[in-house]
């Protein structure tokens, strides 16, 4: 509703409008005119024969528009009547037995245009219609219908025929008293007061009563003639004079303030008539009789030059009895009626809903359930007139107005704001929580992917992408093939999965060669002078690799580096049937831990089991037998990152590399290479 | 609490008779229709008969037309069935049950009396 | 003579949707009711009028009748919905019980 700019009065009326004439929540009474019901056979749905016959009473039930009509909570109303008549009957307008016709279902919501009817008749042998006290089988027929219907005087006529029975009736919806519109949610109350005078119009919109104009009616027209700057109007057809001026039409100055007998011919100057002198032209010696100031029929007696005392009757005060005692004093009209005095006493003329002599009693009391959406209603003076007890969320006089805490719209990120009473609270969308769903939730911040999956958020929760040889939602499940589980490995033999061809390997004690350690290193009948070379040779060759080493060890102990920074040894030569266990790799480097990196083939990535890297063997070069008792024991696990994985593809180098992500601090890789002859671990600080 | 006791269950031969009563307390008996409902080993329910609240109107499933009769004893808050001429297809559980009205159904049950029929 | 016609049995898995049906000529116009009945112990009416719940019947009970089918539904089915259940309605001076259908929560 527009509001012109006013003064701080003109807002206090408008607002008072504005809750007088406004879009509201609707009001309407949906009519159903009952005018025939045929039973001819005087049966039940059952079909089984009435007794003595169907004495009949309809329940109705009116609810939102269904395609198809259940039999769910009747949203809209519903209503019963008495016993109409038996088997078949026609229905008066006014039916007798205390019942209504047509039957009236009251709604306070904007009418949406569209409903479901559901009509059932009954039989009650007795005067008790309560559902206990009717036979089991009671029903006689029950009809549904649904559409639309728009609001109107015009009745639809319907009839619905089931088997046995035939119902003619007819229904409407018409708004209530005071709502207006095409769905009557447009509430307009005619008056005719300080705060409008106009009548409503179908529509809902204001027409102002004669004599008055303005938006809301409220600005009166006045006395044709009027003096437009010197004069203004409360009411038609008046003219109020603006200070300074008087007359019919307000085009009359008025003297100085206390001029008494004097004249102006500009406001506020006073030039005293005849016989009169002083600056107010109000001093005489026969003050009495010259200027009669009592007022109000009082007794004038003169008291010396220009003095005079007024004996006033009963009902006066002041010096010239020119001020009324007014029995409005004491505020003897309740309820918001304004007092006016009267020769005999005075008149309380109360507001809208109050009447009596001092505006005591209202003319609503509880049985008109006053009281709006589950507001509980209090009688007080006996009755006379009332109290209403809002629920939480709804407040006002009649509890019409609804308390919403969301109208803020405080709830972040998608959040839904709910009512809870007294307060409110948000229903955060998946992913987000705080008391204002104002925090984001990480699921990953759990690592909840095992085995080295990597975790991705997403917005209705999290995703796993699991490393080659598990799966599952949470990388939990191995696919691999365990191919050391039938333990295919001869004489104590340690076996090894190679997980890119799940094949196994076996890694020999002494004494034992073969793919299966199956045959043992014996010593035949004739002296084996080919394997004794050998054996001399390599034994001579392993002391020279010692020897090299050392003495590479000792130039690098010369060297000014920090140990802490060492490289890894480089590896060769390795023999085709030995495998490294995991625990004889050592980590010089204690800062890190071993990560390995597999180049551009990421899907050999994923954890099996867990191999470990011994920080406690001293650096030296890897090779078989170190720490013969310490396998598989170690202090540090490389399960957090990547572990090792043993191949036995290519018998020159049976260490091949998976994928780790980098260490984001000190970017150390580990680098296993797969060329012919070599295997080099390195590290890069 | 509301409640629906069901006695004189037994075995008899068939052509034999038995009668059955159904004491009812924690509601006003006298204001309700009753019912008896059977329900044979290993079977569906079957209505037998129903009553009205003051006696007066009675009516029994075909099958047991003329042999059963339904009666009510307002006073003594009780329900009877007298079964005659029974026969073998008559072995059941009979409860007593409380007809809700206004096509509601049956609201409350009895724990059932077990009447088996054979020779 | 009028007969209702329910399925011997419908599976379900818990907190699933169980829908049983029971058939009949223009049922529809009739009201129906539903009784769980779990063994060696008494019937107890769950739905009445088609769609109405007595007090202590939790809300995952649900009923609808139209045409000539009426439906029970039980919403978030529990394990201790597991249980026969009936439909019953009226003809003539006889009360009609379906035949009944064995519900099981696997």
């Known amino acids: 509703m527009a509001a012109a700019s006013r003064s701080a009065s003109g807002w206090a009326l408008l607002l008072l409008v504005a809750l007088w004439q406004q879009r509201a929540a609707g009001s309407g009474v949906f009519q159903l005119q009952l005018q025939e019901f045929i039973n001819e056979r005087g049966v039940l749905a059952s079909g089984r024969p009435c007794e003595p016959g169907c004495r009949t009473f309809f329940r109705v039930c009116l609810k939102h528009f269904q395609a198809v009509v259940s039999p769910g909570p009747c949203t809209f109303g519903t209503v019963s009547t008495p016993v109409l008549g038996t088997n078949s009957f026609a229905v008066r307008d006014d039916s007798s037995g205390g019942g209504r016709n047509p039957l009236q279902l009251p709604f306070n919501f904007t009418w949406p245009g569209t409903f479901s009817l559901i009509i059932e008749a009954w039989h009650a042998p007795g005067d008790d219609l309560r559902p206990e006290a009717l036979p089991p089988d009671a029903l006689i027929s029950k009809i549904a219908i649904q559409g639309s219907l728009a609001v109107g005087q015009n009745w639809l006529l319907d009839e619905q025929t089931s088997t046995l029975t035939r119902l003619r009736y007819s229904y409407r919806v018409i708004c209530s008293d005071n709502y207006y519109g095409d769905n009557c949610s447009r509430l307009c109350k005619k008056r005719n007061d300080h705060f409008g005078h106009y009548v409503c119009q179908p529509d809902g919109n204001l027409s102002c009563l004669p004599g008055w104009t303005g938006e809301y009616c409220q600005q009166p027209i006045c006395l044709s003639g009027c003096h437009e700057q010197n004069g203004y109007c409360s009411k038609p057809a008046e003219c109020l004079c603006r200070p300074g001026w008087q007359g019919r039409l307000c085009n009359e100055c008025i003297p100085h303030n206390g001029c008494r007998h004097g004249t102006c011919s500009t406001p506020w100057q006073c030039t005293c008539d005849e016989g009169w002198g002083g600056l107010f032209c109000d001093q005489d010696l026969n003050y009495c009789t010259h200027h009669s100031p009592c007022k109000n029929g009082a007794t004038c007696s003169n008291s010396g030059q220009r003095s005079y005392t007024c004996t006033c009757r009963p009902g006066y005060t002041g010096v010239d009895c020119e001020l009324e005692l007014s029995e409005c004093d004491s505020n003897p009209c309740r309820n918001g009626g304004s007092c006016k005095d009267q020769e005999d006493g005075y008149h309380c003329l109360c507001p809208p809903g109050y009447y009596g002599l001092h505006c005591e009693h209202s003319t609503l009391s509880c049985a008109d359930s006053p009281c709006f959406n589950g507001g509980s209603c209090r009688e007080r003076n006996q009755g006379a007139n009332y109290a209403c007890e809002c629920p939480p969320n709804f407040t006002g006089s009649n509890c019409e107005k609804k308390v919403d805490r969301c109208t803020s719209n405080p709830c972040a990120n998608g959040g839904q704001c709910l009512n809870r009473g007294p307060s409110r609270m948000c229903r955060c969308r998946p992913g987000f929580t705080g008391t204002y769903c104002e925090l984001h939730v990480s699921d990953c911040a759990r690592n909840p992917c095992a085995h080295g999956g990597t975790c991705h958020d997403l917005e209705n929760g999290l995703m796993c992408t699991c490393p080659a040889g598990f799966s599952g939602r949470r990388c939990e499940v191995r696919t691999s093939i365990d191919a050391c589980a039938s333990s295919p490995c001869f004489n104590r033999a340690t076996c090894y999965t190679d997980l890119s061809t799940d094949t196994f390997v076996c890694n020999c004690p002494y004494g034992f060669v073969g793919s299966r350690c199956e045959f043992p290193v014996g010593l035949p009948p004739s002296f084996p002078w080919v394997a004794v070379s050998l054996g001399v040779g390599l034994a001579v060759l392993l002391v020279l690799l010692g020897m090299v080493a050392v003495a590479v060890r000792q130039l690098r102990l010369r060297r000014p580096d920090d140990g802490s920074r060492e490289a890894m040894n480089n590896l060769s030569d390795f023999q085709k049937d030995n495998l490294i266990p995991a625990a004889q790799l050592k980590n010089t480097n204690q800062k890190k831990e071993l990560e390995v990196d597999c180049g551009l083939d990421k899907s050999n990535c994923g954890k099996q089991q867990n191999h470990t890297l011994d920080y406690n063997l001293a650096p030296g070069p890897l090779g078989r037998g170190t720490m013969p008792g310490k396998f598989p024991h170690s202090d540090k696990s490389l399960g957090e990152k990547a572990p090792l994985r043993l191949h036995s593809e290519k018998p020159e180098c049976r260490i091949s590399a998976i994928c780790s992500p980098r260490d984001s601090m000190y970017q150390s890789v580990c680098l296993i290479s797969e060329e012919r002859n070599e295997c080099v671990i390195a590290t890069e600080v | 609490e509301v409640q629906l006791v069901e006695s004189g269950g037994g075995v008899v031969q068939p052509g034999g008779s038995l009668r059955l009563s159904c004491a009812a307390s924690g509601f006003t008996f006298g204001n309700h229709w009753m019912s008896w409902v059977r329900q044979a080993p290993g079977k569906g329910l079957e209505w037998v008969a129903d009553i009205s609240s003051d006696g007066r109107y009675k009516y029994y499933a075909d099958s047991v037309k003329g042999r059963f009769t339904i009666s009510r004893d307002n006073s003594k808050n009780t329900l009877y069935l007298q079964l005659n001429s029974l026969r073998a297809e008559d072995t059941a559980v009979y409860y007593c049950?409380?007809?809700?009205?206004?096509?509601?159904?049956?609201?409350?049950w009895g724990q059932g009396t077990m009447v088996t029929v054979s020779s | 003579s009028y007969e209702l016609t329910q399925p011997p049995s419908v599976s379900v898995s818990p907190g699933q949707t169980a829908s049983i049906t029971c058939s009949a000529d223009k049922l529809g116009t009739k009201y129906v009711s539903w009784y769980q009945q779990k063994p060696g112990q008494s019937p107890v009416l769950v739905i009445y009028q088609d769609a109405k719940r007595p007090s202590g019947i939790p809300e995952r009970f649900s009923g609808s009748n139209s045409g000539n089918t009426a439906t029970l539904t039980i919403s978030g089915t529990q394990t201790m919905d597991e249980a026969d259940y009936l439909c019953?309605?009226?003809?003539?001076?006889?009360?009609?019980f379906g035949g009944g259908t064995k519900l099981t929560v696997l």
């Open positions: 049950a409380k007809a809700g009205g206004g096509n509601v159904g049956f609201d409350i």
């Open positions: 019953q309605s009226w003809d003539r001076s006889d009360v009609v």
